[in-house]
């Protein structure tokens, strides 16, 4: 067995509606049947969990209903979307992939995607 590497884009710009999407790709060293994907946010030296989902290979990944994340999976690639972002949420978002089953367990951590969020300017009052 060898190390698992995780790739993700260096920079992503959120849309004006506060939505950011990026791909998290991992090189699976084994035949995993159960995979857990976690999005972490690193600000200074503090790391917090944004969202997480476990899925069985071949099935869709499902986040909790109240999660700000959605995603789809295709092979060793996960397409992640984070919603409801505001300027204060600008930061480094790290993709963490765990191959949970069968053993051995593998952990892979991406270098992080810097997500820039710009709050939209409020519409000026119109005289018309």
């Amino acid at each position: 067995c060898k190390a698992m590497h995780v790739a993700q884009p260096a920079v992503v710009l959120a849309s004006s509606r506060g939505i950011a999407s990026f791909v998290c790709e991992y090189a699976s060293p084994g035949k995993a049947t159960e995979v857990r994907v976690t999005v972490l946010r690193q600000a200074d030296s503090q790391v917090t969990e944004v969202c997480a989902a476990t899925y069985m290979m071949g099935n869709e990944l499902t986040f909790l209903d109240d999660s700000i994340c959605t995603g789809t999976s295709s092979g060793n690639q996960v397409n992640l979307t984070i919603q409801g972002l505001r300027a204060m949420d600008t930061g480094l978002y790290i993709c963490k992939v765990e191959l949970m089953y069968p053993p051995p367990y593998y952990l892979g951590i991406g270098n992080g995607t810097q997500i820039y969020v710009i709050d939209p300017e409020p519409c000026p009052d119109s005289d018309f």
């Epitope: 067995c1 060898k2 190390a3 698992m4 590497h5 995780v6 976690t38 972490l40 790391v47 917090t48 969990e49 790290i94 963490k96 949970m100 053993p103 051995p104 367990y105 593998y106 952990l107 892979g108 951590i109 991406g110």
Partner: antibody, heavy 118, light 108 residues
Framework: QVQLVESGGGVVQPGRSLRLSCAAS????????MHWVRQAPGKGLEWVAV????????HYADSVKGRATISRDNSKNTLYLQMNSLRAEDTAVYYC???????????WGQGTLVTVSS | EIVLTQSPGTLSLSPGERATLSCRAS???????LAWYQQKPGQAPRLLIY???SRATGIPDRFSGSGSGTDFTLTISRLEPEDFAVYYC?????????FGPGTKVDIK
């Protein structure tokens, strides 16, 4: 601040069992994976076992597989290690440690000494 | 399991000198999953470096980590009296997680 306090160590005869406990405070226990690491007298560190934050996943070192059970009670902020069929080579200081979100261990207890001897 | 080998076993140096400690893995380890710990006699270990090169909170910048694949290095740029201790590397990328046997840094 983060505190991990181990208990349950002592002298035990070969073949007997022992349960170690670790009382955690100063952080949200239910959000962290927890590990046991041991150190035989005058020797290096040996990773023993890990349990996920919710207890859903557990892994063990080959040296204790089949003899050790790691468990946790999130309502009591307590981690456990049940060791059965103890051997002389299980003699060590057992450390309770906290896992961080990025996978590494960042806090250690002061350890509890287990001596397996007849 | 991944076997970690540390060298040298003992490093005898004087305060102010540079210490270079090596950790070699029996197979490739993700650089995101390699940590270094310091242990002084009678004390629990303390996290120094995680992710091969990230300093833990409160660790002085004289400690630095580098490496990838199977070869990793911990460097102490200028040894202070409190740095004389045993240093362990650990991989946490593949279960079972494993520690190296340690390198003792003592005063020459």
């Amino acid at each position: 601040q983060v505190q991990l306090v181990e208990s349950g160590g002592g002298v035990v005869q070969p073949g007997r069992s022992l349960r170690l406990s670790c009382a955690a405070s100063g952080f949200t226990f239910s959000s962290h994976g927890m590990h046991w690491v041991r150190q035989a007298p005058g020797k290096g560190l040996e990773w023993v076992a890990v349990t996920w934050y919710d207890g859903s996943n557990k892994h063990y070192a080959d040296s204790v597989k089949g003899r050790a059970t790691i468990s946790r009670d999130n309502s009591k902020n307590t981690l456990y290690l049940q060791m059965n069929s103890l051997r002389a080579e299980d003699t060590a200081v057992y450390y309770c440690t906290r896992g961080e979100l990025l996978g590494y261990v960042d806090y250690w207890g002061q350890g509890t000494l287990v001596t397996v001897s007849s | 399991e991944i076997v970690l080998t540390q060298s040298p076993g003992t490093l005898s140096l004087s305060p102010g000198e540079r210490a270079t400690l090596s950790c070699r893995a029996s197979q490739s380890v993700s650089s995101s999953c390699l940590a270094w710990y310091q242990q002084k006699p009678g004390q629990a270990p303390r996290l120094l470096i995680y992710g091969a090169s990230s300093r833990a909170t409160g660790i002085p910048d004289r400690f630095s980590g580098s490496g990838s694949g199977t070869d990793f290095t911990l460097t102490i740029s200028r040894l202070e009296p409190e740095d004389f201790a045993v240093y362990y590397c650990q991989q946490y990328g593949i279960s079972p997680f494993t520690f190296g046997p340690g390198t003792k840094v003592d005063i020459k």
